[in-house]
Interface confidence: low
């Protein structure tokens, strides 16, 4: 059986986020009347027992007993990374190493490349970049709640030689459903501890108009007032509405925004009505067939695409 060396100090490796605080704890079972000491990767003594050896206000004594020496380093910088040594000056000197790893926090991503006023079926290409991560972060894309598959994250070393800049691009064909959608680039990194660090770009998609005719009331009778609403959609929203009646001289006069009004419905109003909604992206005509019967029956109506 190997006998345990009770005078051998022990410690542990630590990981800390840049700007955070790390505690280095060194313990020993049998101190043999000797003091514990902490030194940094440059072999500068930080504390010998409870005595401060290095003038750095970031380094504070947490605990000093014959069996333990604990110190804290606040506002940790990337330059603080490395092997810290705990020593006890017995015969012979015994040491324990603590590897301190400093994580670089990725900056909020920046999205570039957005081209405004995309038209339906054009391809949008966006670029995302985040600097300052260590180790290199990962970038992910999404459109609303839907994941987008960008290209593989590219990694480039920052000028400081310690952190990394990561970048990724995504391309997709836009549809009218994408108008007003938020394209989000998120950075994933262990230093964030699950917190969301993302940037979004709202996109605008121009698309041709569509229209639909809606009667008000839904079931008008002879003698009633009827409004035929022409409801246009599109980006830009249709600004011009023209009503025609098949077999009549065009156009009919609108009296209320995009609606056609019948103050007093007659059987002679029966027929097929067309509403053309126009924007600078194009035109769309919706049709509505109105059958005006006696005061009791319900008119049959339909609307057709052209």
């Amino acid at each position: 059986n190997l006998s345990q060396d009770d005078s051998q100090p022990w410690t542990s490796d630590e990981t800390v986020v840049a700007g955070g605080t790390v505690v280095l704890k060194c313990q020993v079972k049998d101190h043999e009347d000797s003091s514990l000491q902490w030194s940094n990767p440059a072999q500068q003594t930080l504390y010998f027992g409870e005595k401060r050896a290095l003038r750095d206000n970031r380094i504070q004594l947490v605990s000093s007993t014959p069996h333990e020496l604990s110190i804290s380093i606040s506002n940790v910088a990337l330059a603080d990374e490395g092997e810290y040594t705990c020593s006890i000056f017995t015969m012979p000197v015994r040491t324990a190493k603590s590897l301190v790893t400093v994580l670089g926090i990725p900056q909020k991503p920046i999205i570039t490349g957005y081209k405004s006023s995309l038209r339906e079926k054009e391809t949008a290409t966006l670029n995302c970049q985040s600097s300052g991560s260590k180790p290199a972060a990962q970038l992910t894309w999404r459109k609303g709640d839907q994941e987008l598959h960008g290209d593989q994250t590219r990694i480039q070393e920052d000028p400081n030689g310690k952190t990394f800049t990561v970048s990724s691009s995504v391309s997709f064909q836009v549809t009218r459903e994408d108008d007003g959608a938020n394209i989000v680039c998120s950075v994933n990194h262990e230093s964030l501890k699950g917190a969301d660090r993302s940037t979004s770009q709202r996109i605008e998609v121009l698309y041709t108009p569509t229209a639909m005719i809606r009667p008000e009331p839904a079931h008008p009778r002879e003698g009633q007032k009827l409004l035929l609403h022409c409801e246009g959609r599109g980006n830009p929203v249709p600004q011009q509405y023209v009503w025609v009646k098949e077999g009549s001289e065009p156009p009919l006069k609108m009296t209320q925004e995009s609606a056609l009004i019948f103050p007093f419905l007659n059987k002679s109003d029966s027929g097929t009505y067309g509403c053309t909604a126009t924007s600078n992206m194009g035109s769309y005509t919706a049709y509505f067939t109105l059958n005006v019967n006696d005061p009791s029956p319900v008119p049959s109506s339909s609307s057709t695409y052209h």
Partner: nanobody, 124 residues
Framework: QVQLVESGGGLVQPGGSLRLSCAAS????????RGWFRQAPGKEREFVAA????????NYADSAKGRFTISRDNSKNTVYLQMNSLRAEDTAVYYC?????????????????WGQGTLVTVSS
């Protein structure tokens, strides 16, 4: 849990007929519009027909006009699509959809609830 279940699809010869049904559960759909869309292999989903909450107003795509008829039976919470004079280009998965408002809509973004679809194959 909102559910739309389509049925009635299948294999039919050109010139034949099919009647698709769309049954709704999980919400009172009788007060809402309903639409049929279809998606052929390798193509985008396209509008076929829509019907308003009362059944008084219907809309058809050009490709469906004169051949397809949309109707509804609110007592059964069901909407139908009667398809006549079917052609090979009508082959697609047909989807039933319902919006979260009364107003019928003519493109997919106006609909919030979708069925799983039923396959219609027109072939000799």
């Amino acid at each position: 849990q909102v559910q739309l279940v389509e049925s009635g699809g299948g294999l039919v010869q050109p010139g034949g007929s099919l009647r698709l049904s769309c049954a709704a559960s999980g919400r009172t759909f009788s007060n809402y519009a309903r639409g049929w869309f279809r998606q052929a292999p390798g193509k985008e989903r396209e509008f076929v027909a829509a019907i308003d909450y009362s059944g008084g107003s219907t809309n058809y795509a050009d490709s469906a006009k004169g051949r397809f008829t949309i109707s509804r039976d609110n007592s059964k919470n069901t909407v139908y699509l009667q398809m006549n004079s079917l052609r090979a280009e009508d082959t697609a998965v047909y989807y039933c959809a319902a919006p979260a408002s009364r107003r019928p809509s003519w493109d997919a973004d106006g609909y919030d609830y979708w069925g799983q679809g039923t396959l219609v194959t027109v072939s000799s």
